[in-house]
């Protein structure tokens, strides 16, 4: 079941769909699930280089 | 780094089928989505369809159910059966691998040419 | 289904000019979670595309400074501000808000004049 907006705003401006941490978005089954099940950008290894933007792990999105 | 490669394109005659191979290195098709898009000759980028890690399936309402994603996660690759093929379907056929966090196309494989013809 | 319309559908340019391509969707690209998933490709002929611009201004990994990305709700824009050899190709735009099914613009082919 989808969460609906807290709070009325303009239609460019929805309220954020809240996903707890280590959830993130899933925009076909329209919910949040475990980042892990996505693929989501790792943590890397300090100096460790990757082919960016697998960078820090917002799951908000 | 992942990587995607096609195989199974080839010349089929109208009404035929065929399947096309998607075989992952890198990265486990049981996380994420994983993608089919076609590009006809001299034409735009048009999205098949794809199968997630649950192994759910999405596809573009266009194709009329005439195709089917499946996949063999013992061989980290996922399939694209074609059936009554058409004319229309003559296209290069990509697999590719979506990005979660952006739901972006990050990784693409080199393409597959499916020729319709009789 | 988001329709995406691209213009110009191609376009000649010389090198150092800046282009700009523009991108326009059936309705908004603004999800409910306030992302707005609107990307940008580079495909050359007999090659798969390559993502160049990822929700709406982010440039990819290696992608060169010249390539930058605006706008938002229905209208987008990819600007290339001085027009390199390397450069001539064809440019998609695409959305990932209203899935299934994602959905590319037709495309611009950038052309050496």
């Known amino acids: 079941m989808r969460r609906g907006p807290r709070s009325l705003r303009g239609r460019d401006a929805p309220a954020p769909t809240p996903c707890v941490p280590a959830e993130c978005f899933d925009l076909l089954v329209r919910h949040c699930v475990a980042c892990g099940l996505l693929r989501t950008p790792r943590p890397k290894p300090a100096g460790a280089s990757s082919p960016a933007p697998r960078t820090a792990l917002q799951p908000q999105e | 780094e992942v990587q995607l490669v096609e195989s199974g394109g080839g010349l089929v005659q109208p009404g035929g089928s065929l399947r096309l191979s998607c075989a992952a290195s890198g990265d486990s098709i049981t996380s994420g989505y994983w993608n089919w898009v076609r590009q006809a000759p001299g034409k735009g980028l048009e999205w098949v369809g794809n199968i997630g890690y649950s192994g759910s399936t999405y596809y573009n309402p266009s194709l009329k159910s005439r195709f089917t994603i499946s996949r063999d996660t013992s061989k980290n690759t996922f399939y694209l059966q074609m059936n009554s093929l058409r004319a229309e379907d003559t296209a290069v056929y990509y697999c590719?691998?979506?990005?979660?966090?952006?739901?972006?196309?990050?990784?693409w494989g080199q393409g597959t040419l499916v020729t319709v013809s009789s | 289904d988001i329709q995406m319309t691209q213009s110009p559908s191609s376009l000649s340019a010389s090198v150092g000019d800046r282009v700009t391509i523009t991108c326009r969707s059936s309705?908004?690209?603004?999800?409910?979670?306030?992302?707005?998933?609107l990307h940008w490709y580079q495909q050359k002929p007999g090659k798969a595309p390559k993502l160049l611009i990822y929700?709406?201004?982010n440039r990819f990994s290696g992608v060169p400074s010249r390539f930058s990305g605006s706008g938002s709700g229905t209208d987008f824009t990819l600007t290339i501000s001085s027009l390199q050899p390397e450069d001539f190709a064809t440019y998609y735009c695409?959305?990932?808000?209203?899935?299934?099914?994602?959905?590319f613009g037709q495309g611009t082919k950038v052309e050496i004049k």
């Open positions: 929700k709406v201004s």
């Open positions: 590719a691998g979506l990005d979660g966090l952006y739901w972006y196309f990050d990784v």
């Open positions: 309705q908004s690209l603004v999800h409910s979670n306030g992302n707005t998933y």
């Open positions: 695409s959305q990932s808000t209203h899935v299934p099914p994602f959905t």
